[in-house]
Amino acid sequence: RKIPKVGHTFFQKPESCPPVPGGSMKLDIGIINENQRVSMSRNIESRSTSPWNYTVTWDPNRYPSEVVQAQCRNLGCINAQGKEDISMNSVPIQQETLVVRRKHQGCSVSFQLEKVLVTVGCTCVTPVIHHVQ
Amino acid sequence: RKIPKVGHTFFQKPESCPPVPGGSMKLDIGIINENQRVSMSRNIESRSTSPWNYTVTWDPNRYPSEVVQAQCRNLGCINAQGKEDISMNSVPIQQETLVVRRKHQGCSVSFQLEKVLVTVGCTCVTPVIHHVQ
């Protein structure tokens, strides 16, 4: 799913207030809901009819430093007999997410939001058949 | 997929530098890769064997203000005949993502990162059956 553009409103102060100095704003340390948990430790990537593998990208100047990308294993989907059914397609499910980019020059550290496109997993779909008129 | 905890390192200055004043840091305005686009196949939520619907949540003090959540339509998966196969299960694919929370008191505006659990779509899985030896 797509993250809409920021425009020029969200990060600005109300019109009646003095503008933000130097094109930056105050980001409080700490993360709300940091202990929230994903309950997906169940190997669904291997047991799906559209299975996928994970690749981890690592960047120490990004938060989170670790971003996991899924890649569909097959073009078709896996049927009940464990064989690939090429009348169906495994397609990626993608999600735009935000990360924080750290920029530093000596002791001057600043941060900036960055949009990253993450493939979260795969699903099995019926291909669209375009009939000739 | 799960976002690891921040710990106390990412948002801190190097040890040799003076600490960040007031528990906040500088966040530059603007978003890197803002024009990046999601290239997901069309209508996959309806064409999937584990179809889903979308619900939009809106919060003007969050960026992005709009967060889209998927809900699987069925418990089972849809077979080639368009019938629900209850020997297979439609399960949600979840992803932890970051959003920015805006907090303001008068002209004093600050921001904080927040973790949000998003259901991105659904996939069809074979439940694990533990056979008796």
Epitope: S39, R42, I44 | W52, N53, Q71, C72, R73, N74, L75, G76, K83, E84, D85, I86, S87, N89, S90, V91, P92, T119, C122, V125, P127, V128, I129, H130, H131, V132
Partner: antibody, heavy 123, light 106 residues
């Protein structure tokens, strides 16, 4: 231990609606499906449908589509089954029953049952 | 829908006897569950996935079968086993139950 506690008996007039609740405890409500089963007097058990509190997914027996509506309130760990346009043939005991988690057990793998709620439709 | 037909509908047996209840499916199924329902009580899971004993169920109960024919066996019946027994499948939508077999203790 797993417990499913259902709301009390109901007597309704034909054409009315009734909403039966099922409060779950002893497990993580979101992680398991909840099913509803009808048992008319001395009759076989009839599966009505099931709902996944986590994904929102629902599955109905065609015979109960338009008759029963399944919902959940995850904050209260409670499942609901609403019957509309009641008729005398809806007189029965209705059970909620826990299904599987979809990962280690099939969603339709029913193990624990509530005590049942008697719904009587009479003019 | 898959129709499950149990046999017999009713059986009167003496304690210590061996009891066999069969469940025949109108189409092949992968697994069968069995439930016990005592008078004025809710059903209780006895056997899951054809042959697995549910927790707390005495070992005198056992299940077997495949395809369209499944069996629930009670070795050495006890008085507390007086109940109605139901088979159930979740191979095909909708999930269905057998009509029940009522066991009476003589």
């Amino acid at each position: 231990q797993v417990q499913l506690v259902q709301s009390g008996a109901e007597v309704k007039k034909p054409g009315a609606s009734v909403k039966v609740s099922c409060k779950a405890s002893g497990y993580t409500f979101n992680e398991y499906t909840m099913h509803w089963v009808k048992q008319s007097h001395g009759q076989r058990l009839e599966w009505m449908g099931g709902i996944n509190p986590n994904s929102g997914g629902v599955s109905y027996n065609q015979n109960f589509k338009g008759k029963a509506t399944l919902t959940v309130d995850t904050s209260a760990s409670t499942a609901y089954m609403e019957l509309s346009s009641l008729r005398s043939e809806d007189t029965a005991v209705y059970y909620c029953a826990r299904g599987g988690d979809g990962y280690y057990t099939n969603y339709f793998d029913i193990d624990y049952w509530g005590q049942g709620t008697t719904v009587t439709v009479s003019s | 829908e898959i129709v499950l037909t149990q046999s017999p509908d009713f059986q009167s047996v003496t304690p210590k006897e061996k009891v066999t209840i069969t469940c025949s499916a109108s189409s092949s199924v992968n697994y069968m569950h069995w439930y016990q329902q005592k008078p004025d009580q809710s059903p209780k899971l006895l056997i899951k996935d054809t042959s697995k004993l549910a927790s707390g169920v005495p070992s005198r109960f056992s299940g077997s079968g495949s395809g369209t024919d499944f069996t629930l066996t009670i070795n050495s019946l006890e008085a507390e086993d007086a109940a109605t027994y139901y088979c159930q499948q979740w191979n095909s939508h909708p999930l269905t139950f057998g009509q029940g077999t009522k066991l009476e203790i003589k």
